[in-house]
């Protein structure tokens, strides 16, 4: 089965995305209380830079990661190859599923995230994400994330 292609250009996924939901195949140690929009920026050579800020335990955590393009459409590597990331379109317009597998805090983990251009939750996209997660054996509860344009430590 072919991985649905994003096209030759990563521009399709560039810009501002809201992280709507996430799940994993095991308990994630620190669940965010809220998240700022994720900014995906296309770089030379087809790589992507991802930036997001998460409010966890009252602390703002800024995350920047470069997703390195591979020869397979929609497939990237991160953290010096320790993580493999797939970005694929959802059947619901303006939504993508980000699926990654690799190391987190010294253990192997598989996670999926639902991204949307709009802060409002789409039930169609969420249900497709639920089915995707089931198929991938990601049996943790799906966490729907609170959105915040900026991160304020100690509050939302």
């Amino acid at each position: 089965q072919d991985t649905p292609a994003l096209g030759k250009d990563t521009v399709a996924v560039s810009g501002k995305w809201y992280l709507k939901a996430m799940t994993a195949d095991q308990e994630v140690p620190e669940k965010p209380d809220s998240v700022t929009p994720m900014i995906l920026k296309a770089q030379k050579g087809g790589n992507l830079e991802a930036k997001i800020t998460m409010l966890t335990n009252g602390q703002c955590q800024n995350i920047t990661v470069v997703l390195h393009k591979t020869s397979e459409p929609g497939k990237y590597t991160a953290y010096e190859g320790q993580r493999v990331v797939f970005i694929q379109p959802s059947p619901v317009r303006d939504h993508y599923i980000l699926y990654c597998e690799g190391e987190l805090h010294g253990r192997q983990i598989r996670m999926a995230k639902l991204l949307g251009r709009d802060p409002e939750q789409s039930q169609e996209a969420l249900e497709d994400f639920r089915e995707f997660s089931r198929a991938k054996g990601l049996n943790q509860e799906i966490l729907e994330l609170a959105q915040s344009e900026t991160c304020s430590p100690g509050g939302q």
Epitope: F86, P89, P91, E124, K136
Partner: nanobody, 112 residues
């Protein structure tokens, strides 16, 4: 108009086999993860199997593992459920699901 139509149900003896089919229209089929669910008389609807859009990864409820196989054919916009070694407890209406849409279901009865 998004539509899911199941077929292939019927009456089968214990130990027998059936292949259910579901055709989807009105959405980008290849991008949708698909699922089969079932509802036995007087019981809640339960998850049976799912197949992902990304790489056709599959996962099954413990009660059907090793007996049922879910597959898909994106060119035909079809998802299948091959059911082998059927048991009386598999008797139910089987539903296909995409996103938050459901088909009308197909009846499977396992009885001697």
């Amino acid at each position: 108009q998004l539509q899911l139509v199941e077929s292939g149900g019927g009456l089968v003896q214990p130990g027998g086999s059936l292949r259910l089919s579901c055709v989807g229209s009105g959405f980008t089929f290849s991008l949708a993860s698909m699922g089969w669910y079932r509802q036995a008389p007087g019981k809640e609807r339960e998850w049976v199997a799912s197949i992902s859009s990304l790489d056709a990864s599959t996962n099954y409820a413990d009660s059907v593992k090793g007996r049922f196989t879910i597959s898909r054919d994106n060119a035909k916009r079809m998802v299948y459920l091959q059911m082998n070694n059927l048991k009386s407890e598999d008797t139910a209406v089987y539903y296909c699901k995409a996103m938050n849409y459901w088909g009308k279901g197909t009846q499977v009865t396992v009885s001697s």
